[in-house]
Structures are given as C-alpha cells and as structure tokens.
C-alpha cells in the first residue's frame, strides 16, 4: 500500500494509472466503499462522500491513462485509505494528513515560550524535528516547546514530520517582539543634551500599546517614573512626565527621549517597559547614563563620573599632549596645584576613550608680599 503525507490546508494529488493509455472508466472510493468521484465517458461524476466539494480530477490526463484524485484544503479527518478502481484492478493509497500550529500567536514577546503542536490522524506515530532560524534543532512528538525565546529566534522555523519513512515539511514564520538592544549606555559631559533611543527589532502594520521609563538615579534612595506614554498606530503621546528632569519624547517611532541636560543627579539606570496591545507581558530595554564633571576649586583639579561604570574603566587627568598625571580605576581623580594649560579628563575602556571633558587651568600670579 502506497503512503502519501499531506499538509492541513494544502492540496494533494493521489495518482492512479491504467495500463491502457486511454480514457476508460475509473472510480475513487474511501475505506467505507463510499464513492468519491469517477467518470462517465468524458464527464466527471461525484459520489455522496464528505469530500464532494473539495474533490476533483484532471480530465486532461485521462487520455493518457492517468486518473488522479485531487483533494483541496486538506483536513486531518481526510486521512484514510483511498481506493482507485480501474481495469478490474484496485490501487490503494493511504493518505495521512498532518497539521503544525504555533500556540495562540506567531508574534511572541522576547522571553516567552513557543509551543508547536502537531495535529495527526489517529493511529499514526510521527516524529517531528524543527530547526530554528539560528540553526538550533529541537525534537519531539505531538508538542515541541522552546522556552525563553530570543531575538535570534525570529524568522522561519522549518519543521519536518516523519511517518512511514515519508516526510512532510512545514514552515512557520515566528516574530519575536523585542527591542534591538537589551541594554545601552550613554556617556555624557555635565550639561550636554542626552538622547535615548529605543529601536524595536520588528515591524508591524499597526503598533499600539503603552509604556514607561522607570529610573534609578545613583544618588537617589529609590527609583521613580520619569515618563509614561501611549502608543497608537505608531504615534506616541506622553501621558505623564516627571517635573525633574523634564524629558521630551519624539512623536514617532523609534521611541526617542531627550534629556535637556546631563546632570550628576540624573546619572543611573533606567528600564523602559513597553506593553503591546493584545499581549500579556512587556518588552524591556535597560538604559544607563554616565555623567562626567571636571572642576577646579582653588588649588584642586577634580574629575568625577557618576552612574553605572564597570570596575575596569579608567579615569585619568592629563595635561594636553602629555602623559596622564593621575590614572585610576575609580570614580573620582584629582590633581593638587595643577600647572596652567588645557587639562583633559578621560574615561576609557582598554585604551578606548568613552568620555572626555576639557578644563582650562589659568596661571596663578603670586602677588609680592608688601613690606
């Protein structure tokens, strides 16, 4: 008995060939001996089967002795043994129809789970193997689960169903809803304008939801909301903004926030959360702000940084075009009695300068002591 695998929703063509290369009488029946279709001369006739409106044949092939049964919009329950009666012979074809669907939705939030469920006919024992867009293979039976979806899991998942040494392939497009970056860090000199951007890693026709930037300043004892907003069809409207700092928000995607000036009291870490319509859960992006200040107070030249810096970052004070006078893995460095000239405060990571602030030290004129 020939075995043919089909996919739910697809069209399948079951072949039946006569030895004579001419149009002769044929019938297709199911396992209950109910006639599906056949011919009467050059006319196609249909029986009382459930396939009535979905069954067809190719009249153009009858003259060549081919009498296929075409079943459109396959259903799992179409799985059956189909019998072609031609020239006093019977050809049996076993059709097994499978379906593979993703849980609830193919648009999933980063960190959520993807469950792929195989629909299969009773009595079958298929095995399934799926390959993710990043080349990861998962195997299973009726259900396959992938927990903690990552951005790289976005794309086409290719799943192969194996039954009776035959295989059928499914392709499912999965969109992982996430920000392009999980975390970002902005380095600014005191007083500079700060731009925060939160680009999304996906595109959809209509994007509706709401969000908030929650901020923990390094110098504050508790965290607080800096801004809340709504998103309607990719248009951003601010709901509530804190008095200090007075953030501004762009009206279009990507989500974009402007802090008028970087100040030490704003340095810290924020978490932008975005809730999307019809989705439970939220997208998150961490953002960090590091602020540098260089000051000269009497005979002390000081450079300080505030915010989340890694312990391997180096803070240095140097006179322009000279070797660093002081260089430490600390958040503040200073030079006593600095010589005149343009001093540079540098925050660097393995030699790469992340932030630089210049301060001019003027020469000090010693006034003669009066007799």
């Amino acid at each position: 008995k020939k075995v043919v695998l089909g996919k739910k929703g697809d069209t399948v063509e079951l072949t039946c060939t006569a030895s004579q290369k001419k149009s002769i009488q044929f019938h297709w029946k199911n396992s209950n001996q109910i006639k599906i279709l056949g011919n009467q001369g050059s006319f196609l006739t249909k029986g009382p089967s459930k396939l009535n409106d979905r069954a067809d044949s190719r009249r153009s092939l009858w003259d060549q002795g081919n009498f296929p049964l075409i079943i459109k919009n396959l259903k799992i329950e179409d799985s059956d043994t189909y019998i072609c009666e031609v020239e006093d012979q019977k050809e049996e074809v076993q059709l097994l129809v499978f379906g593979l669907t993703a849980n609830s939705d193919t648009h999933l939030l980063q960190g959520q789970s993807l469950t792929l469920t195989l629909e299969s006919p009773p009595g079958s024992s298929p095995s399934v193997q799926c390959r993710s867009p990043r080349g990861k293979n998962i195997q299973g039976g009726k259900t396959l689960s992938v927990s903690q979806l990552e951005l790289q899991d976005s794309g086409t998942w290719t799943c192969t169903v194996l039954q009776n040494q035959k295989k059928v392939e499914f392709k499912i497009d999965i969109v992982v809803l996430a920000f392009q970056k999980a975390s970002s860090i902005v380095y600014k000199k005191e007083g500079e304008q700060v731009e925060f951007s939160f680009p999304l890693a996906f595109t959809v026709e209509k994007l509706t939801g709401s969000g908030e930037l929650w901020w923990q300043a390094e110098r504050a004892s508790s965290s607080k909301s800096w801004i809340t907003f709504d998103l309607k069809n990719k248009e951003v409207s601010v709901k509530r903004v804190t008095q200090d700092p007075k953030l501004q928000m762009g009206k279009k995607l990507p989500l974009h926030l402007t802090l008028p000036q970087a100040l030490p009291q704003y340095a810290g870490s924020g978490n932008l959360t975005l809730a999307l319509e019809a989705k439970t859960g939220k997208l998150h992006q961490e953002v960090n702000l590091v602020v540098m200040r260089a000051t000269q107070l009497q005979k002390n030249l000081t450079c300080e940084v505030w915010g989340p810096t890694s312990p391997k970052l180096m803070l240095s004070l140097k006179l322009e075009n000279k070797e660093a006078k002081v260089s430490k893995r600390e958040k503040a460095v200073w030079v006593l009695n600095p010589e005149a000239g343009m001093w540079q405060c540098l925050l660097s990571d393995s030699g790469q300068v992340l932030l630089e602030s210049n301060i001019k030290v003027l020469p000090t004129w010693s006034t003669p002591v009066q007799p």
Epitope: G209, A220, Q243, A275, E277
Partner: antibody, heavy 119, light 107 residues
Framework: EVQVVESGGGLVQPGGSLRLSCAAS????????MSWVRQAPGKGLEWVAN????????YYVDSVKGRFTISRDNAKNSLYLQMNSLRAEDTAVYYC????????????WGQGTLVTVSS | DIQMTQSPSSVSGSVGDRVTITCRAS??????LAWYQQKPGKAPKLLIF???SLQSGVPSRFSGSGSGTDFTLTISSLQPEDFATYYC?????????FGQGTKVQIK
C-alpha cells in the same frame, strides 16, 4: 521607610466643612503626585482627587467637584483635602495615597481617617 | 468616565485552589490597570501594576494578564492569608476608577 499618615477626620453635620491632612515621610514628597481615595462603610474604593508634584494640576471625581479642594505644601511634606458642603454620602474612610508605583499605580496608602457626616 | 466591572462579586475557595477574578473596562485602557488586595480594617495593598507586572514583595502565586478591556487576576494556589477583597483600578484617564471588588472567602 515610606509613610503616609492621615488626620482631621471626625463627625460633622451635613453642610459643614472639614480639612483632612496627610503627613508624608521617607520619600521626596515634592517628586510625587498624591491622591485621596475614600471608602464608604461596607462599600468599595472610590478615587476622589489627585494633585501634581508641584500642585499645578488637580483632578477630581465629578461628585466632589466644586465642594472639595486638594492642595499640598511641599515644604511641610503635607497633603490636604478641604471638604465643604458635606453630605451624608461623603461619609467614608479617607486614604492619603502616593501615586509612586510603576505604571501610575497607587503604591503607598495611609491607614485612613474616618469622616462621618450626620445630623 | 471609564466603568470597571469585576466578576464574580464573591468567590469561595479552599487552600490550594486556583482562583481567577476578571475585570472589564467599558473602553480600552491599554495596560493601565492595577490590582489591589484589602483585608478588613486595613488599607489596600498594591499587587499588580501595568496589568501583568508583580509588585516587589508580592508572592509569585499572584499573576495578572490582559490588555485593552479584559483583564484577569489569578491566584495559582490559594493560601490562608489570601482571603480578602480584591479591586482592579484603571489609570488610563481621569477620574481613576475602581472595580466594585471581589471577595475571596473560605469555602
């Protein structure tokens, strides 16, 4: 530790006035919106009014508009609710609440002060 | 004003039961929804904010879901200290409004 403590409740005749106060501590009061929420005996919660950090914006539920006034004194870390033309249906426990939670949630509640309007 | 309708108004359960409370908004409120727990003679306590995020210090048996107009609070395994009244509240537009409350009582 964040704390909000209400005071000023009591028995008042219909048509009378009362001023509720709320003393806040343990957080930077001037950085938060504040709300008053009430609960009539055996009933559910009803939001009454709120006020922006520096007091420039105030919102009220329709049933108290024109009768109640919310105000704050950031120098004293205090929130107030001036209630005039009181009615029997204003009888409730009044809670002072900080609107400091994420997604505009009401995160810290006082223990409440009971206002009884009766002749 | 946005009306918030909770159901059921009361539910009886035993320790270990799974309890689900629903809240429906008369118009879309995105995810501007919070859930509170109130015990007799006490002030309400914030459980869930932004429809689905758990407030710090709240046990993980509490969870929230939904967006738009339909929201759910689930207690996965009822504990003796969970017998209380639960309220949903919208923060989408003024005036903020609460649901009428759902009393969770011992069966």
């Amino acid at each position: 530790e964040v704390q909000v403590v209400e005071s000023g409740g009591g028995l008042v005749q219909p048509g009378g006035s009362l001023r509720l106060s709320c003393a806040a501590s343990g957080f930077t009061f001037s950085s938060y919106w504040m709300s008053w929420v009430r609960q009539a005996p055996g009933k559910g919660l009803e939001w009454v009014a709120n006020i922006k950090e520096e007091g420039s914006e105030k919102y009220y539920v329709d049933s108290v508009k024109g009768r109640f006034t919310i105000s704050r004194d950031n120098a004293k870390n205090s929130l107030y609710l001036q209630m005039n033309s009181l009615r029997a249906e204003d009888t409730a426990v009044y809670y002072c609440v900080r609107e400091g939670g994420q997604w505009l949630a009401l995160d810290y509640w006082g223990q409440g002060t009971l206002v009884t309007v009766s002749s | 004003d946005i009306q918030m309708t909770q159901s059921p108004s009361s539910v009886s359960g035993s320790v270990g039961d799974r309890v689900t409370i629903t809240c429906r908004a008369s118009q879309g409120i995105s995810s501007w929804l919070a859930w509170y727990q109130q015990k007799p003679g006490k002030a309400p306590k914030l459980l869930i904010f932004g429809a689905s995020s758990l407030q710090s210090g709240v046990p993980s048996r509490f969870s929230g879901s939904g967006s738009g107009t339909d929201f759910t609070l689930t207690i996965s395994s009822l504990q003796p200290e969970d017998f209380a009244t639960y309220y949903c509240q919208q923060a989408n537009s003024f005036p903020w409004t609460f649901g009428q409350g759902t009393k969770v009582q011992i069966k």
